[in-house]
Each structure stands twice: as structure tokens, then as C-alpha cells.
Amino acid sequence: KSPVFGPQEVSSVEGNSVSIKCYYPPTSVNRHTRKYWCRKGASGRCITLVSSEGYVSSNYAGRANLTNFPENGTFVVNIAQLSRDDSGHYKCGLGINSRGLSFDVSLEVSQGPELPNGTEVYTVDVGRTVTIKCPFKTENAPKTKALYKKIGQTSVLVIDSRNYVNPNYKDRIRLRIPGTGQLIFTVVIDRLRLSDHGLYLCQAGDGSNRDEKNADLQVLEPEPELVYEDLRGSVTFHCALGLEVANVAKFLCRVNSRETCDVVINTLGKRDSAFEGRILLNPQDKDGSFSVVITGLRKEDEGRYLCGAHSDGQLQEGWPIQAWQLFVNEESTIPRSPTVVKGVAGGSVAVLCPYNPKESQSLKYWCLWEGAQNGRCPLLVESQGLVQEQYEGRLSLLQEPGNGTFTVILNQLTTQDAGFYWCLTNGDTRWRTTVEIKIIEGEPNLKVPGNVTAVLGETLNIPCHFPCKFSSYEKYWCKWSNTGCQTLPSQDEGPSEAFVNCDENSRLVSLTLNPVTRADEGWYWCGVKQGHFYGETAAVYVAVEEKKVAGSRYVSPAKADAAPDEKVLDSGVREIENKAIQDPRLFAEEKVVADTGDQAGGSRASVDSSSSEEQGGSSK
């Protein structure tokens, strides 16, 4: 018995389309093997019509395709513009046509329903507009024009030229009679309902001389478009409802178990709290189309979504809709990364952002989600170096660790930084992800002076205290610019007095600028990392002024005689519960040796090899 399964019988009518789904056990071999749709001939051979390898027979050219969905063990054969000749016996299968992994399908294409001669068929989606054309002869030009709906053996008047409108069509129907010379009147019905479906009769005049024309109106509920997206990834619903509703409020809703539709987001400012921080409704175009982006997809986001237009911003019968069925694939290509990153006021966070590894050259961005109205996400930083002004000196986007992940570092945190941020690229939009930054109680682990004033031509030494738990990490100093943070040589100076409870493992790493030049003015970061994975950072601003008094200047750590413009830091240490930074599994084992060459406009700093780092405590 074949493990492939599908419909044993499919019936449709001429001119229509079918979408035949075949199911197979989603083993690794089955997922990747050839899928086919073939027609059984009199000889018993099965001639391939379409396959997953791109083959399409001449008979099917331009009207058929085969799509494989390996994650749920399905492939779908779509065939359009059916004719009676398509009736026959087929197989959908895996591998080679003559082997046993297949399922027999019988396709029957019939002529379609018997309609009165000369009946015009109108096929329109629910909520849309139909224009029924009704021709008449010259002698009936002055006579009454009318449209009837046939219900069983009776005809019910819908509208006529004497201003009668059937209550079921109130405010959504009009009869238009053109100027002289045009022998046709039209009936326009807006906001079509499923109940409008049926046979209509146009009539002009009365008695035996009247003109009649039959119209078959087929009102279709839009068939949902199947959308398959990866867990943790992103989906975009593009909604084009037509110009008629360009100025009407728009919405996206999700169908619930009661078959009603709960608003997910609308243009009136409503948003489902389950999508907080991970949804945007993009402003509509002139044609009234809009799109909704949802990131950080969860399994529970699966379901049927409808977009529509109505002044209430929610689903109402007879208004245009578009439908999707969203599936969230748990076998995701998008790697797990923390959805919540915690930092302390004054401290920092390092956020790991996934991107499609095939798109290493794509531009990387980080934006701040704002929930007001339809939501927006203004860019804060991008890989080419643009940084929003108010983030100068405290935000950097690094290409490391690479191979599908980039890093964003934000320091000098305040409670205002709490919120949702999106990682995105100018490439594959499905890889947009969301991270929430939470500001928790605690003290920063790295301690640097407050803003420092350096004297031109002299030596400046800036200390950075780190606790024992960072002893096995690589320490670095870098000079911040809006294109990144350029690593500088630094010096490990042994034990620090700032962490009295950490014994000899509490250390100091210093940056020496000698001699200080004008180019040295700016932001400097002290940080820790392991391999290409970044941990905490602390920032200090160095201002450069003209020489007043001779002598070298040393910014002393936590001493009573500190210069007045230097802030003395609290010595309390608290571990930040930040998985993106602290999880040791995220760190590579190898150490990167800091470049000790000339940096920062000629200022020279050397690493004192005699004070190289000892193996301290563990990284936790």
C-alpha cells in the first residue's frame, strides 16, 4: 500500500481551476525527492505533466504548477483553465513514475450548470462591486427598466427606473440609464454579500415586446492564500481591496473558534496585546492597498487572517476582504535568540540579531518599535554607519559574529530604553526578529569614570574596572564612531580597588592616550567579549582642552583626590540577568589578541606584557 495520499476524485467545471493536494510521510528522503503529476494513458504508462524539478508539459504550459511544502509533507498541483479534455485518470507521486509511491486521482471536468441561453456569468468576490449590463432595443428606450432576482420559480424585483430599491440592496445598488443612442442600461451592486449569489433577469419594457437578459451572479468568499512561515520569523500580509474603499478604515483580524474575527490591528488605533512590539500596519498607498508585518512568529499565531475595510475598523458582511491561512513551521531555519534582554540603568546590552546567512552582504538595521497609531519602527542604526543623533556614543551595530548573526550594542541605558526593537536587513524580510529590552534593578558590572577632560599633548590614562567573573573574558577599549567602534590597545593593570569583594580577580584595564591630540576627543568604550561574542560595555566621553598646567593627567579610580569633573563610581557589583550577554554557550572558546598598532590619530598606547592577564575565576 502506497504511503502517498490524496483525493481519489476531483470534480470541477470548464474554465475553473483545481488545486490538488497530495500528502506524503515527511521523511528526509521524501522531502527532497522528485514530486510529479502524471496522466495514465491507455497503455498503462503515466506521462509526466508537471514535476517539482521544473518540468511542465506543453499541454500544461502557462496553466499549471507543482509546489512542494516539505515541512508538512504536502505537495500541491494547481491546474487552471480546465477543459473537458482534462477529464481522466492521473497519479500524484514521489520519485519515478513507474514506481509504487503514488496515489490514483480521477479528474472529472463537466460543462457547468445549465443556464438559460445567452446568460452572462459574473464571478465576483464578496464585498466587491459588480456591474450587470442590460441591453435593450430602441422601442424600449422610454420604457421602465428593471432588475429581478430569480428565486425558485418566482422573480423578485431588486431595482427599477421608477426609484424602487429592494430593502436587501438598500444603499448599495444603483441603476444607470445612459444618454440617448446607447442601448444598454447598467445595474451596479456594491459590497456584494454571499446572499446576492444567484440568477438575475434584466428587463426593459413590458408585454411581448420586452427585452430580457439573464445574468448569473456568483459571489465567492475569497479562498485563503496559504502562507508558510518559520517560527521566530516574520510574515507580511499585503492587502489590496480596491480604490472603492481607499478612504475607509482598514483592519487585519484573525478568525476565532466561533467563526467571528478578532481585530489584530486596524487604522483606528486598535491592536491586540498579543502582538505588542511585533506588528506594524504600513501606511496605505494611493490605491488603498496596505500591508501588515508580524515578526517573532509563534506557533499560536497560526490561523486564518482576514484583511478588510469598514468604517468601524472591523469585519462586516458585504465589505471586501482578503484571506490568508498562516502556518508556522516549527522546524525553523531562524536560530533561537533571546526575545527578552535585560540590562541595568547605566549599564549595557548586547543583542544578537539573526539574518539569512546566504545574505552576508545585505545591509543590517536595528529599529525601535513605536506602538502609537498603526505602529512604526524608525531606524536607529545601520551597518553602513548611520546612527540617530540621540544615540551617539552609545549605540553600535557590529557585523560580528557573522555567518547569520550580527550584534547590536547599546550602553548608558536608562529606563527610557525599555521597549521593543527589531532586527532587520534589506534582504530576506522573513528574517525580521523582535527583541524586548527590559531595564532591571542593579549596578553596571564595568566601571569607568564619568566624562573626562584630557589636556592636549599630555598623557591620559582611563581606567575600566571589571569584576572577577570577567577575568577569563577578553577586555578591550575602542573609540566609538558612527561606523562602529575601532579597537585600541589597552593595558591590564592588575587588581582593582573598586571591587573589594572580588579578591585578586577584580581587575583594571586602562586606556592610555599619549600624547593627547585633538582627534582623540570623543566617546570611548570599555568592554568584554569572548571570541566574536560581545558582553557588557561602558562608555566615557573624552573632551580635549588646551594645556593649562604642565604634567601628566591620570584619571584615578575611586580616589578622594579625583578631579572635580570626574565622577567617582559606586563599587557595588550586580550580575545582569542578560542571556544575550551572560549565557556562556554563546561565547566562543578562542581569544582574540588586541591589535597594538597606532590608533586614534597618532596617540600611542602600549600593552605592558608583564601585566598580562592571569587565568582568573570562571566566566560566570
Epitope: 467545471v13 481551476s17 479562498e223 485563503p224
Partner: nanobody, 127 residues
């Protein structure tokens, strides 16, 4: 809310026929799958047959165990669903359930894909 009510079950002899009906009330979508499952006490629900209406095309599925004997049919996307059971055997004895899902998603044989279920009707085939 969609309600499903089955009828037509009963006691028959081997080789005889029965016709089960499933009436759906409440909102029904034009893209809809209706199915019949059966269950014997102590065993899992077993797929019997399904019919899908998508647009104006119909798709009929059935389990190997009933192929050629049972036929599922539906008069229209909004009409009743029937299961015509011919050549009944004692092993067909079970409670037969009508199920529905809209829109049409997932494998029709998988009971988890259906979001509406009837109360069931008993079919007993005696030898």
C-alpha cells in the same frame, strides 16, 4: 458558531446499506471540508471519508478500508453531507462522527485538523 448533527445510524445485517446525514447550521464558508470519522470503544477515531468544496471544485477522499463501498457526497457548499454505506461488514460497527473545518487545511485523515464535531451516531452491523 457551526453546529453539526448526525442522523441515519442504526442496526443492519451484513451486506446491507445505510445512509448517514450530517446537517450543518450556523455560518458555513464556501471553502469547507466535511468528513466522517468512526470510533470503536477503546480505539482512536479512524478516518472514513471527506469532501472539500473549494470554489466550485469538489475533492473526495476515502480510507482504503471503505473504498468502493462507502461514498461521501454533499449537495452544495451549504447543504447536508451524506455517507452512503453499502456492503456493510461487522467491522464497520462503530460510532460515526461528522466533522468540519474551514478553511481547508491539513491532512484530511488527521482528526486534529477539524474544528467542529457532531455528537455521533451509532452504526451496528450484525452477522
Amino acid at each position: 458558531e457551526v453546529q453539526l448533527v448526525e442522523s441515519g445510524g442504526g442496526l443492519v445485517q451484513t451486506g446491507e446499506s445505510l445512509r448517514l446525514s450530517c446537517a450543518a447550521s450556523g455560518r458555513a464558508f464556501s471553502d469547507l471540508r466535511m468528513a466522517w470519522f468512526r470510533q470503536v470503544p477503546g480505539k482512536e477515531r479512524e478516518f472514513v471519508a471527506a469532501v472539500e468544496w473549494r470554489g466550485s471544485s469538489r475533492y473526495y477522499y476515502s480510507a482504503d478500508s471503505v473504498k468502493g463501498r462507502f461514498t461521501i457526497s454533499r449537495t452544495s457548499p451549504k447543504g447536508e453531507t451524506y455517507l452512503q454505506m453499502n456492503g456493510l461488514k461487522p467491522e464497520d460497527t462503530a460510532v460515526y462522527y461528522c466533522a468540519a473545518v474551514s478553511p481547508v487545511v491539513g491532512d484530511p485523515r488527521n482528526s486534529d485538523t477539524y474544528n467542529y464535531w457532531g455528537q455521533g451516531t451509532q452504526v451496528t452491523v450484525s452477522s
